[in-house]
């Protein structure tokens, strides 16, 4: 796995321990918490990042209306179980034997149950809607400039191909970025939209996951784009299964 050879660090994940103990003395980096080897030339999976985070010391409408099946991550942080590839296991449980099913971005998609709960497969999140509100500016951003800058950011910083950025919507002060990636579309080596969205979310919050880099400095034609609120909606290939009690709450 590639890493910065000169000082043996992982440019894409600061929550790693790196040492030159790979084949031929190459730099090899392992994620904190799981100890799994990570590929430092691309984004680390969200599951391994969450695990590392939990192990670290504690500290006229053009906009899209999220579908009734859209999930928001209301449960917050938990220490996830990851499979050997670093993906979320379909069933997650806490220390008190409370279990639930998650989607490919680790967001709960069923009611909580006990150890008898079955999660047959990891359901893929194929559509992510990132809803941002930017701070007041002298005037609105030019839509096509904003679109180009966000696509550049996702391509250059997160290595997500522009074909997976389905649309960028803008109605001042709300920006919506739609990421879409079907199972059939995702080729080997393609960054997962869930991982890109998580890195972006952390960047926006000023909690960059990148090693030794300044925070995200988003500018559109030189004008700073400062985000004051972020909401992320997740749509799965199979709708979630919650009881009526939750839906009417």
């Amino acid at each position: 796995h590639t890493a910065a050879q000169d000082n043996c660090t992982c440019p894409t994940n600061k929550m790693t321990v790196c040492s030159p103990d790979g084949p031929g003395g190459r730099c090899q980096c392992r994620a904190l918490g799981s100890g799994m080897a990570v590929d430092c030339s691309t984004l680390t999976s969200k599951c391994l990042l969450l695990k590392a985070r939990m192990s670290a010391p504690k500290n006229a409408r053009t906009l899209v209306r999220p579908s009734e099946h859209a999930l928001v991550d209301n449960d917050g942080l938990y220490d996830p179980d990851c499979d050997p590839e670093g993906r979320f296991k379909a069933r997650q449980c806490n220390q008190t034997s409370v279990c639930w099913c998650v989607n490919s971005v680790g967001v709960r998609r069923t009611d909580k149950g006990d150890l008898s709960l079955r999660c047959d497969e990891l359901v893929r999140t194929h559509h992510i809607l990132i809803d941002l509100r930017h701070r007041p500016t002298a005037g609105a951003f030019n839509h096509s400039d904003l679109d180009a800058e966000l696509r550049r950011l996702f391509r250059e910083r997160y290595r997500l191909h522009p074909k997976f950025v389905a649309a960028v919507h803008y109605e001042q002060p709300t920006i919506q970025i739609e990421l879409r990636q079907n199972t059939s579309q995702k080729a080997a080596g393609d960054v997962d939209i869930g991982d890109a969205a998580y890195y972006f979310e952390r960047d926006i919050k000023g909690e960059s996951l990148f090693q030794g880099r300044g925070g995200l400095d988003l500018r559109v034609r030189g004008e700073p784009l400062q985000v004051e609120r972020t909401l992320i909606y997740y749509l799965d290939e199979i709708p979630p299964k919650f009881s009526m009690k939750r839906l009417t709450a």
Partner: antibody, heavy 118, light 111 residues
Framework: QVQLQQSGAELVRPGVSVKISCKGS????????IHWVKQSHAKSLEWIGL????????TYTQKFKGKATMTVDKSSSTAYMELARLTSEDSAIYYC???????????WGQGTTLTVSS | DIVLTQSPASLAVSLGQRATISCRAS??????????MHWYQQKPGQPPKLLVY???NLESGIPARFSGSGSRTDFTLTINPVEADDIATYYC?????????FGGGTKLEIK
């Protein structure tokens, strides 16, 4: 304004290596990867690969692995491409370029003409 | 790799007439309503210049006599009316899949 300034034409012998450069100006250098494209009479335009000015690593098409080596010097905002074990097949114009929003090439260097001849 | 087949290889058109260049991709280059197909003009001694991006969007500063159309695998660049300054070679390029690939080019000449 965005500019990509490439090094001058090269006339070299077969078997040797050559290193061509591409200096970016008028934009934040680490915001855009540098792509390299070969243009020859035989094959029209061919993408060779890219170097991420952000991460510093390079990606090559299968055909150019072992032939091309891309590097970057952030301090001088310059990307380099070295071509090894040159043959007459490598005679071509080599362009550096930047990608636009939908991965089209919207800025190009003026091109470096490479002639390999004994 | 996605193969782009351009036709014709060369085209002679009278000034003021319409020129139509075709580009066929070996597989679809569309994704969620976006066609990742672009067109360039290249004059001798110059690098290629972007004319049309995403199949039908004219790059700023390009005259309106240039237009692009098509989706999935079949795309067309139209120049209407042709002017003397349009003598050049035209290339299509797909960016749906890495590596990006180019068509073989169409050389436009004046009758």
């Amino acid at each position: 304004q965005v500019q990509l300034q490439q090094s001058g034409a090269e006339l070299v012998r077969p078997g040797v290596s050559v290193k061509i450069s591409c200096k970016g100006s008028g934009y934040t250098f680490t915001d855009y990867s540098i792509h390299w494209v070969k243009q020859s009479h035989a094959k029209s335009l061919e993408w060779i690969g890219l170097i991420s000015t952000y991460y510093g690593d390079a990606t090559y098409t299968q055909k150019f692995k072992g032939k091309a080596t891309m590097t970057v010097d952030k301090s001088s905002s310059t990307a380099y491409m070295e071509l090894a074990r040159l043959t007459s097949e490598d005679s071509a114009i080599y362009y550096c370029a930047l990608l636009g929003a939908y991965n089209y090439f919207d800025y190009w260097g003026q091109g470096t003409t490479l002639t390999v001849s004994s | 790799d996605i193969v782009l087949t351009q036709s014709p290889a060369s085209l002679a058109v009278s000034l003021g007439q319409r020129a139509t260049i075709s580009c066929r991709a070996s597989e679809s280059v569309d994704s969620y309503g976006n066609s990742f197909m672009h067109w360039y003009q290249q004059k001798p001694g110059q690098p290629p210049k972007l004319l049309v991006y995403r199949a039908s969007n004219l790059e700023s500063g390009i005259p309106a006599r240039f237009s692009g159309s098509g989706s999935r695998t079949d795309f067309t660049l139209t120049i209407n009316p042709v002017e003397a300054d349009d003598i050049a070679t035209y290339y299509c390029q797909q960016s749906y899949e890495d590596p990006p690939t180019f068509g073989g080019g169409t050389k436009l000449e004046i009758k």
